[in-house]
Interface confidence: low
């Protein structure tokens, strides 16, 4: 728990009446359907808002769909319909928005059955003007956007072509046919794969990967006999077909595919999956399937070039291909990442990490639960998080884990307290500590949003019945006060707040429902007036992250370095503000074992920080394929963990020598495939 | 119309540095990866460097690795290649390249760096 | 490295003969494969890119074809301003992106 804090309720003065003062009802001219809403930019205010209502007629469907804008963070909402001459927008492809503060936004219509292409609506003004654009093309694809250049659109069209804008969609160019899946890269390059023999499904396995570095003016061909390729941070992953079987391989590249080198994780068969589950450009987290339809697989962590990989955890849960994983990055602290594993007995575990999957450990017991009854042991059991899998199994668990990088150490999440994930109607937890000690934050399910850089949390209860009723904290989650918005209850649908967690208004979202019809209708609070100053330097008090013992001179040392921030106090009830700026002083540690991850052909035994060489390896040479040279490793089996920062203390030695042999364990030359570099 | 203009060749002695430079203009330069490509007197071409369109990326044959490096300026739409240690067989013409990926599509005209004593 | 085996190094040829160079690579290198053009003092020129397609603005009697590790560059009906050295070059996986050691087309 962060220090000095005041345990006490205090409550927030004549909050009611301030409330009331910046609460705003905003009633839609709409038949209820489906609605969607997105946010236009960063601190701009601007929300676009999508309504789409289908009524069946006997020979067809008729849709209607209005599009709604505010500027001032849903307080007041503006029907722009006429923008967009009326048109039925298709919501599978959502409002794509522009990258960055671009006020791009581009709506994809929905176009007669014999149109010899789609249409799409642009703006570049935050969605103040609309040009409507007819496409030579039928999308498949919502439009992407490169990250570097926001003028720069690909799509995929109904037929496998890939589609290039490089004026914002004004004009489009088919630069490719026969196209299964495109991604943008870095420097504007388009990476994709694809077909010869006539589709996608029917070629998988023996897809080729190609690259344009200049929007289709020239390719390169940069992979063959590909099964699906991902990119994450700096490194571009493809899966690859082996040459003898039907199995399949991880490839690596860190040059955008001009060299590739084989990873040393297991292969996969027909049925199985590779999935990365983060990337950042120090490293990946990649899990790999078990054989069979067993619902788990193994979390491997990788080296800095992502070709070592390290077992970092068994069992892990995730199902089939596409399917359901927990695996959740907490954001509000460096290092920290929550997990499920399925045991033995198929019961449902949560694991957390605090060093990028170093170690996994349960999660510490709430001080102010007990255990349920899946604890064999009533004094002895963990915190279980639900998560996305708990969702897709329809638990009563409206909302995944919830953390935010700018709201340091704040993780709020629905739980459940025994040996394994429970079936009951779970509790919310927050931790103020990136996941080392939790507290139980609120009875039963509910959904969740953070303000202000964690300067307040907001909570409305799950509940099959309308509400009218909003709960909120300025004290990290301690305590609750409610707040009646609204006179006549309304069926809650989602909580919307700016991404960022910089903002104090909460949008509450719902339907009124009457004996007639039923209506959208918004309640936008803004709580600048319950933090009613702001926050000055006596209201912060310094944290050490990671801290476990104090007395320890390397406590808080992860990755090889100690953070101090500066965190808000508890009992303080001011404005952090939206130019807030998470204060942080790092220190760097001395290196020790737990500094380093076991090198090629080496192996950490359970509870040991020393690396052991693997057994069917002893004395052998080891050597690996790396950009298609053979390489001589000269190790005491440890290899610095990517990321991290520590100097001095420990220095285990490691040599990588240059056969001067050509290998190709990669499958740019897969005919001449070297079995002995794996 | 494209352009590549290549720069600062001339005579060095053995051991000394000498650092080229490649003028771009008629082309969008930020998109494009950039090549160094030689020609020594009656002899062939012969690939020197390549560097990505953000200048991520760098690449050098064996032989020249640590000696030769290749840089870029995308706001002032310039190639650099800075040439150490010279010795008498690094005598060549040198060319600037545009490298969409699969080609080498624009080329300067050269610059001659001769390396004597 | 990928070894580039350009053939003939020089032929004689008069205008209007069809002209066949040749490019063998030590593997495969998936039509990676581009074609120069060099007049003396001049920087060289690009012909042909991924083994088949013609640059802009060069004349149709130049032609690209093979795929593997067998390339080849046909002009047909030689014209005079076709008298250069003609150079290939990979661009497959791993560099060193290689050139061949050119071929000299001479007026007979």
């Known amino acids: 728990s962060a220090p000095g804090e005041d345990e006490e309720c205090g409550r927030v003065r004549d909050f009611v009446a301030k409330l009331a003062n910046n609460t705003h009802q905003h009633v839609f001219d709409d038949l209820r359907g489906s609605v969607s809403l997105s946010w236009v930019g960063d601190s701009t205010g601007v929300i676009l808002v999508l309504t789409t209502f289908h009524v069946p007629l006997v020979i067809m469907t008729f849709g209607q769909s209005k599009l709604y804008r505010s500027e001032d963070y849903g307080k007041n909402f503006k029907d722009i319909t006429d923008l967009i001459n009326n048109t039925f927008i298709r919501t599978e492809f959502g409002m794509a928005i522009g990258p960055e503060n671009s006020g791009k936004v581009v709506l994809t219509a929905e176009v007669s059955g014999g149109s010899r292409g789609g249409r799409i609506f642009r703006s570049s003004d935050f969605a103040k003007n609309f040009v409507q654009t007819d496409l030579p093309f039928h999308p498949l694809t919502q439009m992407m956007y490169s990250p570097q250049n926001s003028d720069y659109l690909l799509a995929l069209s109904t037929e496998n072509g890939l589609w290039v804008s490089k004026n914002f969609g004004g004009k489009w160019e088919e630069i490719h046919k026969a196209v299964c899946l495109a991604k943008w890269g870095s420097d504007n390059t388009i990476f994709f794969t694809t077909y010869a023999n006539g589709s996608c499904k029917a070629d998988l396995g023996a897809l080729e990967l190609w690259r344009t570095s200049d929007l289709g003016k020239s390719f390169k061909t940069i992979g063959v006999k590909i099964y699906s390729f991902g990119l994450g941070g700096r490194f571009l992953f493809a899966s690859v077909m082996a040459d003898k079987d039907t199995t399949r391989r991880i490839h690596v590249s860190t040059d955008q595919g001009d060299t590739w080198s084989m990873a040393q994780l297991p292969s996969v068969g027909q049925e199985q999956f590779y999935s990365i589950l983060a990337a950042n450009d120090d490293m990946v987290f990649m899990h790999v399937d078990e054989p069979g339809d067993t619902g788990f697989g193994t979390i491997f962590t990788s080296d800095d070039r992502g070709i070592v990989y390290s077992k970092s955890l068994d069992r892990h849960l995730y199902t089939t291909t596409g399917g359901e994983t927990d695996f959740t990055n907490v954001t509000s602290l460096r290092g920290v990442y929550i997990t499920s594993v399925l045991s033995e007995d198929n019961s449902i575990q949560t694991m957390i990490t605090f060093d990028q999957g170093g170690r996994w450990t349960h999660l510490r017991k709430p001080e102010n639960s007990e255990c349920d009854a899946t604890a064999k042991n009533k004094n002895e059991c963990s915190l279980h998080i639900h998560a996305s899998y708990s969702i897709s199994q329809k638990l009563n668990v409206p909302m995944a884990p919830l953390s935010e990088p700018n709201a340091v150490g704040i993780v709020i999440a629905h739980g459940s307290v025994g040996d394994a994930i429970s079936v009951m109607v779970p509790d919310v937890y927050i931790s103020d500590d990136g996941g080392y000690s939790w507290t139980k934050m609120l009875e039963g399910p509910h959904y969740y949003t953070i303000l202000d850089s964690g300067g307040i949390i907001v909570a409305i209860e799950h509940s099959s019945r309308p509400i009218n009723v909003i709960k909120f904290s300025t004290d990290e989650g301690q305590c609750w006060q409610t707040y009646t918005f609204t006179r006549d209850p309304i069926y809650f649908t989602g909580l919307a707040s700016e991404p960022g967690a910089r903002s104090m208004n909460i949008s509450i979202w719902g339907f009124t429902e009457s004996f007639l019809t039923s209506q959208w209708v918004s309640y936008t609070i803004d709580f600048k007036d319950i933090l009613e100053r702001n926050c000055e330097e006596k209201d912060y008090t310094i944290w050490l992250a990671h801290s476990t013992d104090p007395e320890d001179y390397e406590d808080g040392c992860i990755l090889g370095y100690k953070e101090q921030f500066l965190r808000l106090r508890k009992s303080s009830v001011c404005q952090n503000g939206r130019d807030y700026v998470v204060t942080k002083q790092p220190s760097i540690c001395l290196c020790s074992l737990e500094d380093f991850l076991c090198d090629f052909g080496y192996y950490r035994p359970e509870n040991d920080s020393k690396c052991v060489e693997q057994p069917e390896l002893k004395g052998h040479d080891l050597e690996f394929c790396l950009y298609g040279r053979e390489e001589h490793l000269t190790t005491n089996g440890y290899r610095k963990i990517p990321g991290d920062k520590c100097q001095g203390g420990v220095n285990p030695v490691r040599e990588v020598k240059d056969l001067k042999k050509k290998c190709t364990s990669n499958f740019l030359s897969p005919e001449k495939q070297n079995s002995k570099s794996n | 119309e494209v352009q590549l203009v290549e720069s600062g060749g001339g005579l060095v002695q053995p051991g000394g540095s000498l650092r080229l430079s490649c003028a771009a203009s008629g082309f969008t330069f930020n998109i494009y990866g950039m090549s160094w490509v030689r020609q020594a007197p009656g002899k062939g071409l012969e690939w020197v460097a390549t560097i990505s369109s953000g200048g991520i990326y760098t690449y050098y044959p064996d032989i020249l690795k640590g000696r030769f490096t290749i840089s870029r300026d995308n706001a002032k739409n310039s190639l650099y290649g800075q040439m150490n240690s010279l010795r008498a067989e690094d005598t060549a013409v040198y060319y600037c390249?545009?490298?969409?990926?699969?080609?080498?599509?624009?080329w300067g005209q050269g610059t001659l760096v001769t390396v004597s004593s | 490295d990928i070894q580039m085996t350009q053939s003939p190094s020089s032929l004689s040829a008069s205008v209007g003969d069809r002209v066949t160079i040749t490019c063998r690579v030590s593997?495969?290198?998936?039509?990676?494969l581009a074609w120069y053009q060099q007049k003396p003092g001049k920087a060289p020129k690009l012909l042909v890119y991924?083994?088949?397609n013609l640059a802009d603005g060069v004349p149709s009697r130049f032609s690209g074809s093979g795929s593997g590790t067998d390339y080849t560059l046909t002009i047909n009906s030689l014209q005079p301003e076709d008298f250069a050295t003609y150079y290939c070059q990979h661009f497959w996986g791993t560099p060193p992106w290689t050139f061949g050691q050119g071929t000299k087309l001479e007026i007979k």
């Open positions: 593997e495969n290198i998936y039509s990676n």
């Open positions: 390249a545009r490298h969409p990926g699969g080609a080498m599509d624009y």
């Open positions: 991924a083994a088949t």
